[in-house]
């Protein structure tokens, strides 16, 4: 009982339970397909315990197998100007270091305005995850429509 209480007082990071839940801050200009994220208690249901944000991209601090999840809803779904047509694609991948660059998730909106997915994947300390949204006009920043997170599952 005493051990359980002591364990509860330790920060999640020290137990290896790295976790992050982020909300959308902004997109890049047209030629930059990345989504830029923000997180922290001041924003509400958003937090970082272990991983950190580097210029809006999520950087992993502990090796392990992670559950990566994402949902993106488009604010402009049917474009009146069709300046950037569907198919709109969302890709989540390791974008740095370059030696580990790989796509982890790729989704298409097709006729829908929202996509969501998750997968288990090994990640290493120093891996930076990028979320690229191509072909669309604007994703929603509403916190129950667009969010991105990782959860450490096991070594």
């Amino acid at each position: 009982q005493r051990f359980a209480q002591a364990q509860q007082q330790l920060p999640l990071e020290s137990l290896g339970w790295d976790v992050a839940e982020l909300q959308l801050n902004h997109t890049g200009p047209q030629q930059d397909p990345r989504l830029y994220w923000q997180g922290g208690p001041a924003l509400g249901r958003s937090f970082l315990h272990g991983p950190e944000l580097d210029k809006g991209q999520l950087r992993i601090h502990r090796d392990g197998i992670y559950m990566v999840h994402i949902q993106v809803t488009l604010a402009i779904c049917s474009s009146t100007t069709a300046s950037r047509h569907h198919p709109t694609t969302l890709a989540v991948g390791i974008c740095s270091p370059a030696s580990r660059s790989i796509s982890l998730l790729r989704l298409s909106f097709h006729q829908g305005c929202t996509i969501a997915s998750q997968r288990l994947t090994p990640l290493a300390r120093g891996d930076t995850l990028c979320t690229n949204l191509t072909g669309t006009l604007l994703p929603s920043r509403n916190t129950d429509e667009t969010f991105f997170g990782v959860q450490w599952v096991r070594p």
């Epitope: 997109t27 488009l74 049917s78 100007t81 006009l137 920043r141």
Partner: antibody
Framework: EVQVQESGGGLVHPGGSLKLSCAAS????????MSWVRQAPGKGLEWVSA????????FYAESMKGRFTISRNNAKNTLYLQMNSLKSEDTAVYYC????????????WGQGTQVTVSS | QAVVTHPPSLSASPGSSVRLTCTLI?????????ISWYQQKTGSPPRYLLY?????????SSGVPSRFSGSKDASANAGLLLISGLQSEDEADYYC????????????FGGGTHLTVL
């Protein structure tokens, strides 16, 4: 044929409130972002507010934040603009338009509804 | 917040070409802005003409003749509306709207240019 029709304009005293409506037809309303733009007498256009297709994301011009609220009822194909604490400088023709104005043009406009704020 | 300016008026002859400018004066680079153009005739609501970010990202309204085209002039830090083969019915007020791409900040309309076809 795409149509948007504003209503709800009128004369209101400074500090008063008014709710504008915009009825849409001829397109799938619940998949399009919508906007409000205004034009003061003899002046240029001023973007007021926009709302995403779902209503989840709203945008406002800085000078209207906190006083104006944009909303939509997708079941009724209707866009709204609730205007509170009105000032004389809010006197304008208010247009409803299809599109967001952010990263895309406003392709279809209504005829506008006149809002006059005067004592 | 972006600030954009238009020359208040412009005159040109039928059949000639005219270049309307939408100059960004807030210190930002026009290259990072989405520009939309609108035409408004007296007593009528605005009419959407075209959208331009780059040659890869542009759109022309279906009812708008190809005489109207959009571009940017990086050296002048301006969005451009080019009208060739000017016709009397082109006489109107023209407005640009500028949105800083990806910023989620409110788009800003320029004050408008009144085009007179002599």
């Amino acid at each position: 044929e795409v149509q948007v029709q504003e209503s709800g304009g009128g004369l209101v005293h400074p500090g008063g409130s008014l709710k504008l409506s915009c009825a849409a037809s001829g397109f799938t309303f619940d998949t399009y972002a919508m906007s409000w733009v205004r034009q003061a007498p003899g002046k240029g256009l001023e973007w007021v507010s926009a709302i995403s297709w779902s209503g989840g994301e709203t945008f406002y011009a800085e000078s209207m934040k906190g006083r104006f609220t944009i909303s939509r009822n997708n079941a009724k194909n209707t866009l709204y603009l609730q205007m509170n604490s009105l000032k004389s400088e809010d006197t304008a023709v208010y247009y409803c338009a299809r599109g967001m104005g952010l990263a895309e043009g406003l392709t279809d406009w209504g005829q506008g509804t006149q809002v006059t704020v005067s004592s | 917040q972006a600030v954009v300016t238009h020359p208040p008026s412009l005159s040109a002859s039928p059949g000639s070409s005219v270049r309307l400018t939408c100059t960004l004066i807030s210190g930002d680079n026009i290259g990072g802005y989405d520009i939309s153009w609108y035409q408004q005739k007296t007593g009528s609501p605005p009419r959407y003409l075209l959208y331009y970010y780059s040659d890869s990202y542009k759109h022309q309204s279906s009812g708008v003749p190809s005489r109207f085209s959009g571009s940017k002039d990086a050296s002048a830090n301006a969005g451009l509306l080019l009208i060739s083969g000017l016709q009397s019915e082109d006489e109107a007020d023209y407005y640009c709207s500028a949105y800083k791409s990806g910023s989620y900040k409110a788009p800003v309309f320029g004050g408008g240019t009144h085009l007179t076809v002599l």
